[in-house]
Each structure stands twice: as C-alpha cells, then as structure tokens.
C-alpha cells in the first residue's frame, strides 16, 4: 500500500539522527529521487544533502574500520618487536654486566685499564644490532687490533712502543693469531647471530611500518560512492531492514582495497622469511648462545694472549726489531692472571622459545591479512545478511546478488561491477611498501645464509616514504677508525617503533 508506513521516513529519520545529523533535513515522507547522485533514483527518504552526508560518513566509517583492523595488527607486531628487542638487549646487557663483574678479578689491570675498549665494543654491538651501518667484521677486527696494542703495551711495560712499532705489531699479528681462535669464532658466530637477531626485529618493524603506512592510504572517490551505495542506499530507498548481500559487500571492498591486496605475495614472503630465520636462534651459533656469551670469548682471547705471550713477543721482535727499553725503568713485576671461564653455552632460559612459538603462531595468523581484509570487514563491520538470499540488499533493491565475486588484487578488478577501478594506476604508496617488503625479505634471506647485509642499500628509494628502517644521526655512513676510538660519542639508531640509546629503554 503506497500510503503504508514504508512510505514514511521514520526509520531513516531515526538512523540519520543517531549519526548526529540534523533532523530538519529529513523529509517526513518519500520524495522523488531524481536528485540522487549515488543511490538508485526511485522514491527516496534522502535529500541531496543527506546523500552527501551519508556518503562522507560511510567513507569515514570504512576508513575507521580499516584503521582499526590495521591497529590491531600493528599492536601485535609492536608487542612482538618490543618483546624480542627486550630479550636480545637483555642478553647483551647481561653479558656486559657479567664481564664488568668478573673481569676485574680475573684479569686485573689487563681489564681495568681497557674497560673503555670493552665498553665501546658492547656499544658497537648494540649499534650494530640496532641496524647501524657498521660492518661487524671490521668493527671486531678494529677492536682486536686496538686491544692487542693496549695489552701488548701493558704486558711489556719495560718497552717503549711508539705508534710505528704498534703498526708493525698489527701487521705481524695477522699471521700470529695472538688471541687464539676466539676472534675468528666470535666473528663467525656473532655475525650470524647478530644479523639474524637484528633482521628479525627489523622485519617486525618493517611489517608494522607497512601496515601503518598502508592504513593511511585514502580510499578513492569511486570507493566512497560504492560504499555509500552498499551501506546507506537501502535506507534512502525505504528498505532499511535489508542487510547487504555478502558477495555484494565483498565485491565493493575488493574494489576499494584492490591495491592493498597486492601486498599479499610480498607480505607472505616476509612473514615466511621471518619464521624461517628463527631457526637461527638456536644452537652454538644461535642468538641466545652467542649474544649472551660475548664475554666468554673475550675472556678466552685474553687468556690465549697471555698463554701465547712469549711466542708472540719473540715473533714480533723478530719481525719488527727490538724496541727501545722504557727510559724510566722496566715497570712493575709481571703477575699473570688467568680468567676462570664461565661455560660458553648459556643454558636456554626458555624465554626465547616461548617468544618464538608465540611469534610463529601470530605471524601465521596474519599471513593472509591483506586478502582476507574485504571478507573480514564485511563480516565484522558491515552487518551482512546471513545468507545470499532474495531478502538482502544488492545495491539496487532487496533481492539476490547475481554477479560473481572478483579475484584479489588490482588486476582482478577490471570487471568489478561495483567499483570502477583504474587498474593502470596502482597506488604509489602501496607500491613503495611492496618494495620495502621485498627489500626486507631479501635482507632476511641473506641473514638466513649468515651474510651481513648492508642495511643502507635500499633503505631510501628517494620517495620520502620508506619504512623507517634507515639510520639516524648519519649513523649509516659511520666508520670507526682505530686512532679516533678514544673520542667516540655514543650514537643512537632507531629501529622502527623503538627509541633507545645504548640499551636504555624509553617507551
């Protein structure tokens, strides 16, 4: 009956008012709909202004829903990042604390007079872990070279050892292995362990950053129209009880989120690579074993130097000549001190295993985040009809939705009946984020193979919207020279989502 309640606009008035809009705009009864730009032009309860307001609102609601979903994912990634970062930092800090507690007693002045060099090494390891563009092998080589000079001087207080003699010592030392196997072992293990730890944590940071940046990508005008039609046109057309047909909703959101779905392949690759690299957290070259035991390699090295001292000295003098004796006398009587070694293998605390199993489960859960987003938003945010039946809203009326559901991604939207998508114009922000995912995946794959990766290589593509994995304070180009070591200043490097200096946390 044309004069029945369906002709009145009471329900629309109620919904419209609940959204905070002025009720004075709402007609008392249906009016002719030639003025409608988005909804079908039958009799309607919506004026042009109402249609525009509802279109803007539906657009905002979808963006909010999208951001909410992204925020949940970001929060999960940020929590993971913080947990792993805390754990890795804790391992390194623990090792340094053990060194500071045990080395003075174990090695006396051989340690206390070089405490700065050891402190610097831990700072460099921290910087390296934070993603600074330090070459770890070079950093370690410089540390050993500097330490050898200082210890050689200390072990030979009776000799005058000018810089040119120390340079010669350094050249001789390469073949003599004064610290035994410790430097080589530490280099091999630390490179693998630190690169695994830092690339994993950086992977979490990049993933979180990508989600954040993609959530900020605006939805286009064609999407706005389609969402308005999906969500509010049923109200305007006098069928307010009709919920959107599920396939109709999916087509709208697949069209709206076509670019986002193109992240899927590289997103999966990244998460797979992250899960894979956790294999490198175990065993004798594993993260926990190595990062937590740096001090034991250092103790072994000093012991080896003391054990090899006579042979080393003889060969250095043979190669570099007899240096002058100290003009002020032979120095104190030597007291050789051997550091008692703690076991190198740290018994696993169980913390890392727990973190890894949680991370693996959560990363698997979000692997299909981008392609499942349309379905998730439809089912969670769009109050869909429970079945594809004749009673759901199909965009034109209450009835069956006949078009097939589109595939995922931009290319598959060429014939999307609900959203006009220009598949020749991919969103640039999303393309850049795909590139960031690829770069990070490559880093993780290199890290899996134990290779130190130059973290500068692709952290700036010139676009101004990278993934936050670049370096602060010119750190990436930082190279430490042996001679300038005494005047180093602490520098910071930001991992995405973290701000930290020398292991001190600030949330």
């Amino acid at each position: 009956d044309p004069a029945s309640k369906s002709r009145s606009c009471g329900e629309v008035r109620q919904i419209y008012g609940a959204k905070g809009f002025s009720l004075s705009d709402v007609p008392q009864a249906e009016i002719s709909g030639e003025h409608l730009r988005i909804c079908p032009q039958g009799y309607t309860c919506c004026t042009s202004e109402m249609e525009e307001n509802l279109a803007n609102r539906s657009h905002a609601e979808l963006e909010t829903a999208l951001r909410d979903s992204s925020r949940v994912l970001q929060a999960m990634l940020a929590t993971q990042l913080r947990s792993f970062d805390d754990h890795f930092q804790h391992l390194l800090n623990d090792s340094e604390r053990t060194l500071q507690a045990t080395f003075p007693g174990a090695f006396g002045e051989l340690y206390t007079q070089n405490a700065r060099a050891f402190r610097d090494l831990y700072s460099e390891l921290r910087l390296y872990y934070r993603g600074a563009n330090l070459h770890l092998e070079e950093t370690l080589a410089e540390f050993w070279a500097r330490l050898l000079e200082r210890l050689f001087k200390q072990l030979h207080p009776q000799l005058l050892l000018p810089d040119d003699y120390l340079d010669c010592l350094g050249k001789q030392a390469e073949a003599l292995r004064p610290f035994g196997e410790a430097p080589r072992e530490l280099r091999l293990r630390a490179t693998r362990a630190f690169v695994a730890a830092r690339s994993f944590v950086q992977g979490l940071g990049v993933a979180s950053d990508v989600v954040r940046k993609v959530a900020q990508v605006p939805l286009g005008p064609e999407c706005s129209r389609a969402v308005m039609k999906l969500v509010y046109c049923a109200h305007c057309l006098g069928v307010p009880g009709a919920r959107p047909c599920p396939d109709y909703c999916r087509n709208v959101l697949k069209g709206c989120l076509a670019n986002q779905a193109d992240l899927d392949a590289e997103w999966r690759n990244l998460l797979d690579s992250m899960v894979l690299i956790t294999d490198k957290f175990w065993g004798t070259s594993g993260v926990e074993s190595v990062i937590g035991s740096v001090h034991t390699w250092l103790a072994e090295a000093i012991n080896a130097l003391q054990d090899n001292r006579d042979t080393l000295t003889a060969k250095v003098i043979q190669g570099c000549g007899n240096p002058k004796v100290n003009p002020q006398g032979p120095g104190p009587e030597e007291k050789r001190r051997r550091g008692k070694l703690a076991p190198r293998e740290r018994p696993p605390s169980g913390t890392l295993e727990k973190l890894v199993s949680e991370a693996k489960a959560q990363l698997r859960d979000v692997q299909d985040f981008w392609i499942s987003l349309p379905g998730t938003l439809c089912s969670e945010k769009m109050a869909l009809s429970t079945a594809s039946d004749d009673r759901c809203w199909n965009g034109m009326a209450r009835g069956r939705y006949l078009p097939e559901v589109m595939g995922d991604g931009l290319a598959n939207q060429i014939n999307n009946p609900e959203v006009e998508v220009d598949i020749t114009k991919p969103d640039m922000t999303i393309r850049q984020q795909i590139m960031q995912l690829k770069i990070m995946t490559n880093r993780l794959r290199s890290a899996y193979n134990g290779n130190d990766v130059d973290f500068q290589d692709a952290s700036d593509d010139g676009s101004g919207s990278g993934s936050g994995d670049g370096c602060l304070d010119d750190l990436c180009s930082r190279k430490v020279s042996r001679k300038s070591s005494s005047s180093r200043t602490p520098l910071t490097h930001a991992l995405p989502g973290l701000s930290e200096q020398e292991g001190q946390k600030t949330s």
Partner: antibody
C-alpha cells in the same frame, strides 16, 4: 759527555744510616731512570732497583725492600741511596748506573764503598 | 723472576786464545741481554747490548750471539787487557738480573 759522579767512601757502625749521592751530567736528568747496583767484596753484581726520575717513584727488588731508600734532588740532577739500620752484610761498593735506549748500562758512577764495622 | 746462569764460573786462558762465555736465562729475554767486563776496583764496562751489538769503543775481537734463553760472548785472540770478570745482564722484565760472573784469568 755523560758522567755519573758518586760521593766518597763511608765507614759506619751497625744500626747507623748512610746516604750516598750520585750526580749526573751531560744529559737531561729526568729523561732516564737511575739504577743502583750492589757489589759485596769479592762477589758479583746485584741490581737493587731504580728510581723514576720523572715521578720520583722508587722500585726495589725483593732483596732490597725495607731498609733501602732511593730519592732525588732533581734540581741538582742528583740521585741518592740511603741505607737505614746498617748491618755488616751491607758492606759493599754501591754503583749508580744509567741504562741505554736498548738496554745495558753504558754509564756507571765510580762506586761508593760503604764499610759497616763495629 | 728471570734467573741468569753464567758458565763457566772461572776460566784460565792464554793471550791469543779464543774463549767463549755462556749465559742461560730461565725465560726468554728476547735478545735484551748485555755483557760487561769489570776489572778489580773499577766500575763495570758495557761491551755488548741487545745480545750482539758492540758498545762504542769496544774492540771487534769481542762478539755476542744467541737468542731466546741461550747467549754467549766470544773473545777472539785474547789480549792482556781482556782479563777480568765478565757479567751478563738481561733487560727484559723486572728485575733486570745479572749473571753470577765469569772470572777470566791468565794461564
């Protein structure tokens, strides 16, 4: 040329103190430590230790810790050896010596004979 | 401490002969070894430093050799003024100890 000139012979009773001097010339006094060497009659040379002429810090070998004291008067380029509570076994010639850059004592004082007798 | 052991403790030789005195260190002294000659009532005189380098004014008939822990002083064609007591001394580490001495007498 470099010279080390020591004070003359001393005759002391047990329990007394003796202080002998060694005046250096011909080089910058504070550039090299001053060493002291003991030689008992008919015996070999024994290195007693040295004094850092920059800091004035003395270092004694184990056999000469306690009653022996090295000191300086830098302004006069002079080093001193003092022996307290003298014993008969302290009877010896005491030499001051300066070492060379690569080891060895090319420069010696003429020696000071200290005789301890009651 | 590094101990220095000299041998022989005494030795008789004739003018024109060649003699060798040896010095053994209880640890490697890395060539930081000196030889002295001392005549009765005189200060010692440096002959050799860094095991083989002759000190200024020392005749070439004197020569030093050795490495590690074993060192020797050789005197070719002994001259009358060469008789006296010879000492080795290491300069490697604290303390800079002397050997016990070798008394070289005319036969």
């Amino acid at each position: 040329q470099i010279q080390l000139v020591q004070s003359g012979p001393e005759l002391k009773k047990p329990g007394e103190t003796v202080k002998i001097s060694c005046k250096a010339s011909g080089y910058a006094f504070t550039d090299y430590s001053m060493n002291w060497v003991k030689q008992a009659p008919g015996k070999g040379l024994r290195w007693m230790g040295w004094i850092n002429t920059e800091t004035g810090e003395p270092t004694y070998t184990d056999d000469f810790k306690g009653r022996f004291a090295f000191s300086l008067e830098t302004s006069a380029s002079t080093a001193f050896l003092q022996i307290n509570n003298l014993r008969n076994e302290d009877t010896a010639t005491y030499f001051c010596a300066r070492h060379y850059d690569y080891g060895g004592f090319p420069y010696w004082g003429q020696g000071t004979l200290v005789t301890v007798s009651s | 401490d590094i101990q220095m052991t000299q041998s022989p403790a005494s030795l008789s030789a004739s003018v024109g002969e060649t003699v060798t005195i040896t010095c053994r260190a209880s640890g490697n002294v890395h060539n930081y070894l000196a030889w002295y000659q001392q005549k009765q009532g005189k200060s010692p005189q440096l002959l050799v430093y860094t095991a083989k380098t002759l000190a200024d004014g020392v005749p070439s008939r004197f020569s030093g050799s050795g490495s590690g822990t074993q060192y020797s002083l050789k005197i070719n064609s002994l001259q009358p003024e060469d008789f006296g007591t010879y000492y080795c001394q290491h300069f490697w580490s604290n303390p800079w100890t002397f050997g016990g001495g070798t008394k070289l007498e005319i036969k």
